[in-house]
């Protein structure tokens, strides 16, 4: 009984198509597969960013796989051939591992890369990223931002930089069609006549960095002698009402502060007839239905009601928030 053996895949490599972190892992079938013509060979692929404790594992019949990586670090991957038990009289056979690595040769010292990179997707409409220059870089240093997401043919450079003292310190992005719910890759590199500048890579999903506009049209309605309903409206824009959570701050007679987080555009407050003044503000955030994370909006304009009218049936005063 001869032991069944199989070779590892050939020409295993990591290919960088220039998508700022979205890489292709590809390979060719192993040599000497003639004995297993009737068999469907599978491959077990393991890969990770160097320094990560866990490997991602994929079993596939294909000769390629694509995924996103952090190009600030190196990447390591290994693959072996699997022969299913149907091909080998009852036991799965594995080849030895083929291994490969990939990294971008770093230029410049780490301190030269941009600091405090911050990106916000305002009202799910306008993406703005800002950064600070690296430590100790000279004024002749300039930074350039490139970005890519699935759907673009190639990485694009920012065309509308925010500048300070002649240096690029941010980017206003154009309209980004079909760009949410997928990884968005950014590279900020730099150039200087005096010393090389280290590149920085960032990956996020746009729906998770949305900062909405504040709610508008805050109103009061007395429901009963001891209940007042607070209402507001969602701001103009592409975000539907079901995507919002709200935080309310209510102040009664300059003393009691009530805070609450709610899902709808109303909140019912228990009050007494003694209440003389009522003020509230609201802010909004994209909720778990539409994102994994988000940024609270600014607080709305404050809406107050004072005096005798508070005990009457309806208190309604529109107050438009100006942008």
């Amino acid at each position: 009984d001869t032991e069944i053996k199989v070779n590892p895949p050939q020409d295993f490599e990591i290919v960088d198509p220039g998508y700022l972190g979205y890489l292709y892992l590809q390979w060719q079938p192993p040599l000497s597969l003639d004995h297993f013509k009737e068999c469907t060979v599978e491959y077990e692929l393991k890969y990770r960013n160097i320094g990560s404790e866990t490997w991602k594992t994929i079993i596939t019949k294909n000769l390629h796989y694509k995924d996103g990586f952090d190009l600030n670090k190196g990447i390591e991957a290994k693959i072996h051939t699997l022969l299913p038990w149907q091909c080998t009289n009852g036991s799965e056979v594995q080849s030895s591992w083929a291994e490969t690595t990939y990294w971008i040769s770093p230029q410049g010292i780490p301190e030269t890369k941009v600091q405090d990179m911050d990106c916000v997707y305002y009202n799910w409409q306008y993406l703005l990223c800002s950064w600070k220059p690296g430590i100790g870089v000279l004024l002749d240093t300039n930074y350039n931002l490139f970005y890519w997401y699935e759907g673009l043919d190639h990485a694009l450079q920012c065309v509308d930089y925010i500048k300070a003292d002649g240096q690029n310190i941010g980017c206003r992005f154009p309209y980004l069609e079909a760009s949410d719910y997928k990884d968005f890759y950014i590279c900020v590199n730099g150039s200087s006549e005096n010393k090389p500048i280290r590149s920085s890579y960032f990956t996020f999903q746009l729906q998770n960095i949305v900062k909405p506009l504040p709610p508008v049209y805050l109103t009061f309605t007395r429901e009963s002698s001891c209940e007042i309903k607070l209402k507001w409206s969602i701001p103009l824009g592409p975000i539907p009402a079901r995507c919002f959570d709200y935080e309310i701050e209510i102040r009664e007679d300059d003393t009691t502060l009530v805070t609450a987080t709610v899902e709808n555009e109303t909140y019912t407050l228990k009050t007494t007839n003694e209440t003389r003044q009522l003020c509230f503000v609201v802010r909004s955030k994209v909720n778990i239905y539409c994102s994994d994370d988000g940024i609270w909006s600014e607080w709305s304009d404050k809406q107050c009601w004072e005096g005798e009218d508070l005990s009457k049936k309806t208190l309604l005063r529109h107050h438009h928030h100006h942008h």
Epitope: I239, P240, Y289, C290
Partner: nanobody
Framework: QVQLQESGGGLVQPGGSLRLSCAAS????????MGWYRQAPGKQRERVAG???????VYAASVEGRFTISRDNAKNTGYLQMNNLKPEDTAVYYC?????????WGQGTQVTVSS
């Protein structure tokens, strides 16, 4: 037409446990969040727990530490594990799957906590 079907409700004694399931008939879980709501007689419907597409969770203060929400995108199913149940947890429990484009509700499953 996408449908959500809750199951797992029933009668349980105080201190007991139940696990609710919410199965979707279509592939709507991928980028949508999922939530569990409840409505007791004469009360407003309230969100008990929610989970985003990436697995971030939120809980109502009244169930924090007792209820756990989870999801299995491959099976298009969400779950609510309810431990240490109290009489005040008695309600009809509804699941919801929603996102920027979608908003679907189940028909509800009755949970009764009584000795």
């Amino acid at each position: 037409q996408v449908q959500l079907q809750e199951s797992g409700g029933g009668l349980v004694q105080p201190g007991g446990s139940l696990r609710l399931s919410c199965a979707a008939s279509g592939s709507i879980f991928n980028t949508n969040g999922m939530g569990w709501y409840r409505q007791a007689p004469g009360k407003q419907r309230e969100r008990v727990a929610g989970i985003s597409s990436g697995g971030n969770t939120v809980y109502a203060a009244s169930v924090e530490g007792r209820f756990t929400i989870s999801r299995d995108n491959a099976k298009n199913t969400g779950y609510l594990q309810m431990n240490n149940l109290k009489p005040e947890d008695t309600a009809v429990y509804y699941c919801r799957v929603a996102g920027r484009q979608d908003d679907y509700w189940g028909q509800g499953t009755q949970v009764t906590v009584s000795s």
